[in-house]
Structures are given as structure tokens and as C-alpha cells.
């Protein structure tokens, strides 16, 4: 769920998601449209696709709570929960490390980006 994602992103990137990523660009945060603005925004667009796939599989992406371990900079998704919980953790782990990989190109100007400026084709999944 959202609480899992926020905690994981903070642990992996060292940034407060609510201040740094939700929202950011055209796809980080609720919703998403248009062409992603940079690599960080692409991480979020890919994560949206990951969630969309789980929704088609009947998973409650915002309600499902999963367990994971964070140690020595790595995330280990627990294999104890349901299929949905494990897949949700995998989606969130991927976006957390994607955001970390792209910290060097993070642009403060894209925080709280005005969504009407998000134009172009929204990438397919």
C-alpha cells in the first residue's frame, strides 16, 4: 500500500517522498499523463504500469499491506504474504531503486509540476 511505498522510497533514496516525489513531473504521484519529463518521471510511469497490471489481476494495490526487510541498502520482499502482496512489494522495490539510480538527474523544478503542461503521447504499458 501507500504506507509501504512511502517508507521504502525514503529508506532507499534518503528523500522524503511527500516532499520530493509526490508529486514530481507528469507521473509521480496520483494519476499521470503525457510524456515523462525525465528519467525519474519514467520510473513513476513504469511503476504506474506495474500497478495497472496488478489491478487487472484483482489486487487491491492501495489497501494491501506487505512485509519486507531493508538491510545494508537492499530490500527483501517477504515470501510469506499472498501473491498480490509479493507482487506489490516487487513493484515498489523496482520504483524505489529506479528513483535512487536517477538521483543525479533529479530536477527541483519538476517538483509540483503543473500537470496541464504534461503534453504528448502517454507511453503505453
Amino acid at each position: 500500500g501507500i504506507l509501504n511505498l512511502n517508507k521504502m522510497v525514503k529508506q532507499v533514496t534518503g528523500k522524503m517522498p511527500i516532499l520530493s516525489y509526490w508529486p514530481y513531473g507528469c507521473h509521480c504521484g496520483l494519476g499521470g499523463r503525457g510524456q515523462p519529463k525525465d528519467a525519474t518521471d519514467w520510473c513513476c510511469q513504469t511503476h504506474d504500469c506495474c500497478y495497472d497490471h496488478l489491478k487487472t489481476q484483482g489486487c487491491s494495490i492501495y489497501k494491501d499491506y506487505y512485509r519486507y526487510n531493508f538491510s545494508q541498502g537492499n530490500i527483501h520482499c517477504s515470501d510469506k504474504g499472498s501473491w498480490c502482496e509479493q507482487q506489490l512489494c516487487a513493484c515498489d522495490k523496482e520504483v524505489a531503486f529506479c528513483l535512487k539510480r536517477n538521483l543525479d538527474t533529479y530536477q527541483k523544478r519538476l517538483r509540483f509540476y503543473w500537470r496541464p503542461h504534461c503534453r504528448g503521447q502517454t507511453p503505453g504499458c
Partner: antibody, heavy 120, light 106 residues
């Protein structure tokens, strides 16, 4: 050979606490990913999952019964316990413990079951 | 929670007859699991991850399905197949079982 065996009081009165023990062999509850669950079956009826406990003491409960259930383990004695508080006649059933192997979403080995009757 | 509805609840089949037991999920699931239970015995894992036979299960059994519709099939009924069969999911919490199908020998 993996085996599990349940034990319980047999008969108890309404409003009492039901205490069940699952004694197992052939695997260790210290193995990463390993879990043991409890399932019950009223006579002539279907199966109902109650709770799981895992190697790292993580516990999962059926939400409809969560307030009445407590699962625990004694790893050194290869035992898992289940307590159900405030029982009534609807808790009369055969109670099974079963192993959930690492990375699986089902119970691969089951105990023989113990019958519990709650009298009013 | 995901509700699993099995049909039929009770059925009978003659030796050699093809048998199909259905399990319908209230929402989509990734895999279905099946158990066989004979009177006075505990359930035995029978089919895992929708179509894989558990150890010792005769090849006349098969499992199939996707989404919300799953089934267990016996290609040719034998006397020893008379039992109750239960489907189970752990796609999402909590883990749930179907109410069971009782298969009798005609």
C-alpha cells in the same frame, strides 16, 4: 519424512479458551520462508483458514476471527500453538495444522486433525 | 475477501466417466490449488499452481483455468477418486477455500 500432529482438549464449555498444540517433525520452523497454519472443518462442512505463523515469528490471522485468535510457536520443541478465546458451539470442528513451504501459496503437508466439541 | 464457489456441490460418476469440477472466484486470481479429502482423513494437496499434479496423483487428473474460472478434471473416473475436492486461493489475503465438491461413485 514430514509429519504434523494436533492435540487439544477434546471437549470444553462455551466461553472457555480453546488451546491447541501442533507438534511437527521432518522440518524446522527456523528455515527461511517456512510457515505453519491452522485450518478447521466443522463436521460435514468445508475448510476455514484460521492463522499462520512463520519462521521469523510473523503472524497472519483470518480477519473474521482475528480478535479471538492467538498463534505462537516454540521452535526448540518443534511446536505451534493456537488459542481461541470465548468459544461457542460454532467452534465445534476438526482442527488441522499444516505446513506452508517456502515460496508456496498452499499447504503441502497436513496433520491428521484433532476433534474439538464445544458444549453449551 | 475472495469467495470461491464450487460446482456442483455433490455429483456422482460411473467408472470410466469424465468428471469436471468447477471453482469460480469472485475476483481474478493468479493460481488455484486443489485438495482431495476422503472421509475420516485430512485433506491432501492434489493440484498446485492451477495445473501441476502433487506427488503421487494419478495422471488422469488435470487442472486448468485462469482469471475467475478454474477446474479440476478426471479423464476417466475410478473408484478411488470418490472423495471431496476443495479449491483454495492465496492470491490475496485472507487465504480462502471453496465449500467443496463431493464426488461419489455411481
Amino acid at each position: 519424512q514430514v509429519t504434523l500432529k494436533e492435540s487439544g482438549p477434546g471437549i470444553l464449555q462455551s466461553s472457555q479458551t480453546l488451546s491447541l498444540t501442533c507438534s511437527f517433525s521432518g522440518f524446522s520452523l527456523t528455515t527461511s520462508g517456512m510457515g505453519v497454519g491452522w485450518i478447521r472443518q466443522p463436521s460435514g462442512k468445508g475448510l476455514e483458514w484460521l492463522a499462520h505463523i512463520y519462521w521469523d515469528d510473523d503472524k497472519r490471522y483470518n480477519p473474521s476471527l482475528k480478535s479471538r485468535l492467538t498463534i505462537s510457536k516454540d521452535t526448540s520443541r518443534n511446536q505451534v500453538f493456537l488459542k481461541i478465546t470465548s468459544v461457542d458451539t460454532t467452534d465445534t470442528a476438526t482442527y488441522y495444522c499444516a505446513r506452508r513451504g517456502p515460496g508456496t501459496w498452499y499447504f503441502d503437508v497436513w496433520g491428521t486433525g484433532t476433534t474439538v466439541t464445544v458444549s453449551s | 475477501q475472495i469467495v470461491l464457489t464450487q460446482s456442483p456441490a455433490i455429483m456422482s460418476a460411473s467408472p470410466g466417466e469424465k468428471v469436471t469440477i468447477s471453482c469460480s472466484a469472485s475476483s481474478s486470481v493468479s493460481y488455484m490449488y486443489w485438495y482431495q479429502q476422503k472421509p475420516g482423513s485430512s485433506p491432501k494437496p492434489w493440484i498446485y499452481r492451477t495445473s501441476n499434479l502433487a506427488s503421487g496423483v494419478p495422471a488422469r487428473f488435470s487442472g486448468s483455468g485462469s482469471g475467475t474460472s478454474y477446474s479440476l478434471t478426471i479423464s476417466s473416473m475410478e473408484a478411488e477418486d470418490a472423495a471431496a475436492y476443495y479449491c483454495q486461493q492465496y492470491h490475496s489475503s485472507p487465504l480462502t477455500f471453496g465449500a467443496g465438491t463431493k464426488l461419489e461413485l455411481k
